[in-house]
Each structure stands twice: as C-alpha cells, then as structure tokens.
C-alpha cells in the first residue's frame, strides 16, 4: 500500500482542516488508514483522524481543531496499521479556505433596488470576521449568457444593485463566496443559491 498523491490540507481558520490524498489503488480509507496530527506545542497530544473515501483511491480527513492562530504548525503522520506511509507538516494559516457565507437573501421590496444580504460565516472573535471580501454571482435561469459577478470589497455583507440592470420578468439566481486577502486564501465554496423573480416598473418614456 502506497500513497500516490501526498496529502494536501486546507483550513477554515476556525475549527476544521480538511486533508485529501490518493492511494495507489482502491482503499477502504476508514478501516485501513489513520491520519495522526499533533500541534507543535509544549505538552500537546497526538490526535487521530479517521478518513473517509473520496472516490475509489481517494481519501479525505476532517481534522478537528479548537481554533487556529497564525503560529500554529502541525505534524501529520499517515499510518496503515503499524506502517508509516507518509510524514509531513501543515501550517493552517498558510492554507486557508474560508467557510462559505450563508443565509443569502434577496430583498425585492425596496423601490427598484435589489438588496442582497448574507451572513458572515465567522463569529466576531475570529480573525477572519473583519477581513472577508465577497464575490456575488447573479445569473439568469433563462439565458446562460446573462451571468455576472459583483465584487464586494467592503466589509458589510450586502450588495445593492438597481433592478433595472437586470431584465424584467425573468427569474434570476444568486450565490456568494468569500476570501480574505490578509492570508492570501483561496475562495470559499459558493453559498447555496437563492432564486427570485425580477420585476420592476419600466420608466415612462416621453416622446
């Protein structure tokens, strides 16, 4: 049994780091493998992660952590029974993938303005809470070419757009994702999308 693709890990900078790897053949990850992780810190203990299958030869493990600070560094040991398959290290602050925003809502009751709001996925005491910026994706269900991205570079988790920038009488969907420049993170996954029917009064044209 050998590791074909070494584990790569990302942290949500809150409580979970996710490590993925590939074996050289079909593997029952949860029965055959264990990923041990230990913070490089005085009097820390080794903790065990039981991996799950992620495709035939792929494995994924969700490492539970209490919280994360920039100094944290972990040793990782991948074991198959008594055999050490791979040894590595992981610094969560250097491999951050933020949590996806939630509760995306489209408020259509503001006069000819669409107000999109969502929730910051972090609690106020987490460092990323005040460092997230967002991308909002809006697209038409009827017209695949009608697809747009709005970059929200301020901290407030909301976006206002004029309803008239979208077509009237058509159903649209929106989703939002987050990233943090301070840690040069990857983008989060997209939030679940939300749907609304776009309708607004066309301005009366005078001839």
């Amino acid at each position: 049994m050998k590791v074909l693709q070494e584990p790569t890990c990302v942290s949500d900078y809150m409580s979970i780091s996710t490590c993925e790897w590939k074996m050289n053949g079909p593997t029952n990850c949860s029965t055959e493998l264990r990923l041990l992780y230990q913070l490089v810190f005085l009097l820390s203990e080794a903790h065990t992660c039981i991996p799950e299958n992620n495709g035939g030869a792929g494995c994924v493990c969700h490492l539970l952590m209490d919280d994360v600070v920039s100094a944290d560094n972990y040793t990782l040991d991948l074991w198959a029974g008594q055999q050490l398959l791979w040894k590595g290290s992981f610094k969560p602050s250097e491999h951050v993938k933020p949590r996806a925003p939630g509760n995306l809502t489209v408020h259509t009751n503001v006069s000819d303005t669409l107000l999109l709001t969502w929730s910051n996925p972090y609690p106020p005491d987490n460092y990323l809470y005040n460092h997230l910026t967002y991308a909002v994706n809006i697209w038409s269900e009827n017209d695949p070419a009608d697809f747009r991205i709005y970059n929200v570079t301020y901290l407030e988790p909301s976006l206002r757009i004029a309803a008239s920038t979208l077509k009237s009488g058509i159903s649209y969907r929106a989703r939002v994702r987050a990233w943090a420049q301070c840690y040069n993170t990857t983008w989060s996954e997209w939030s679940p999308s939300t749907k609304w029917h776009n309708s607004y009064r066309e301005p009366f044209e005078q001839h």
Epitope: L43, V69, S70
Partner: antibody, heavy 125, light 112 residues
C-alpha cells in the same frame, strides 16, 4: 477541593534512588499535564520535568535527563518521579503542580494553578 | 534556554504603597495575540508557591484585584496597587512557552 499530595522523599546516599509520588484529587487527573519543580535550600525555583495527560509527551531539565523518569498512572490519579543516580545537588524540596489541559489540540494553559505541599529529598553520605 | 531576568531582587515597600516587579525574557514569549506564556508566582515563607498571574495578564482564581500583570513579547511587569502585610515573600516570573520552563531569580518583597 482540588489537591495534590506528594510523598516518597527522604535521605538517600549519592548514587542511590528514590521514587516520589504525587496523588491528585478533586479534578479530572488524566486531562491535565503535570509538572515537577524543585527548590534547593535557600535557592529559587527550578523546573524538573513535565508530562502530558496521556503520558505520551515528556520533557526533562538537562540537569536530570537520563537519571530521572517522570510517569503517571491515570487509573490511580498519581504522578511519579523515579530518581536514580542521585547527587548532592539534587537535594531540594520537590513540588508537583497541575499544568495545562492537554486533551485539547492546543493545550489550554491556566498556569501551574495547584501545587502540592512539597516533599524533601536529601542526598548525603 | 530562555533566560528570565527579574528586577529588583529586593523590594522594601511601605504598606498601602504600590510595588512593581519587572521580568525580561531573552526571547519573545508571545505565541499569538493575547497568549504570552508568562506566569507570576508568590512563595510565602515555609509555603508552596501560589499562582498569581498566568498568560501575562490573567489573574488566577481567588487572587485579589490589587495584583495585575502586563507586558508582551519579552518585557513583563507585576504590579501591586497597594501592598499589604500579607504580600511579603518571594515573587517569581516563569515562562512556559518552551521546554525547559525557566524561572526568574526571585524578588524578595518585604515591608519597610
């Protein structure tokens, strides 16, 4: 009441051995790292050794490395310090102390917040 | 090893007056924001040491609020706002960030 009680001290000749014990009560012993600190007569405090809650992680001062062994029996809520090849400079009061909560991924530290009453070790011929 | 240097080594104080003890580490004891691994202990005559302050500034349970700790990185201070007769003894700073734990030499606080 959270309490630590040391025992096992006494007079021993140079080159001899002693085993100190530290019985913990009033707290979940296995979840805490434990530490030994000593104090030579008229001197300051000196750290000796520490052990994590499971016993899987151990540290020693250079002055005792290879001679002293720290261990614990969580089923008995007891910490030990096996002292071999004793020297005159090991003469001191030995204290055990409750250290950080080591069951968390990053051990949670609240200082050495409980100390035993101390047990006296005298090494002399 | 991290060296902890305390000053002064002797501190005569009038009851009711403030007192301050300094502790300097040979390298930073800051692990992350708010986590300076420095403690302060008081050892009264014939007794075991008792914890006063941990993580640089957090007061231990049952410790009077006249005791406070401050500082970050390498420089730390223990302050007693109004010294009482019962505060006499030896005060030690200690670092617990890396092995070996190391103590300062101790400061003897006595009443004038």
């Amino acid at each position: 009441e959270v309490q630590l009680v040391e025992s096992g001290g006494g007079l021993e000749q140079p080159g001899g051995s002693l085993r100190l014990s530290c019985a913990g009560s009033g707290f979940t012993f296995r979840t805490y790292a434990m530490t030994w600190v000593r104090q030579a007569p008229g001197k300051g405090l000196e750290w000796v050794s520490s052990i994590s809650g499971s016993g899987g992680n151990i540290y020693y001062a250079d002055s005792v490395k290879g001679r002293f062994t720290i261990s614990r029996d969580n089923s008995k809520n007891t910490l030990y310090l096996q002292m071999n090849s004793l020297r005159a400079e090991d003469t001191a009061v030995y204290y055990c102390a409750k250290d950080r909560v080591s069951i968390y991924v990053r051990p949670r530290y609240y200082g050495l917040d409980v100390w035993g009453q101390g047990t006296t070790v005298t090494v002399s011929s | 090893d991290i060296v902890m240097t305390q000053s002064p080594l002797s501190l005569p104080v009038t009851p009711g007056e403030p007192a301050s003890i300094s502790c300097t580490a040979s390298q930073s004891l800051l692990y992350s924001i708010g986590y300076n691994y420095v403690d302060w202990y008081l050892q009264k005559s014939g007794q075991s040491p008792q914890l006063l302050i941990y993580l640089g500034s957090k007061r231990a349970s049952g410790v009077p609020d006249r005791f406070s700790g401050s500082g970050s990185g390498t420089d730390f201070t223990l302050k007693i706002s109004r010294v009482e007769a019962e505060d006499v003894g030896f005060y030690y700073c200690m670092q617990s960030l890396t092995s070996p734990y190391t103590f300062g030499q101790g400061t003897k606080l006595e009443i004038k």
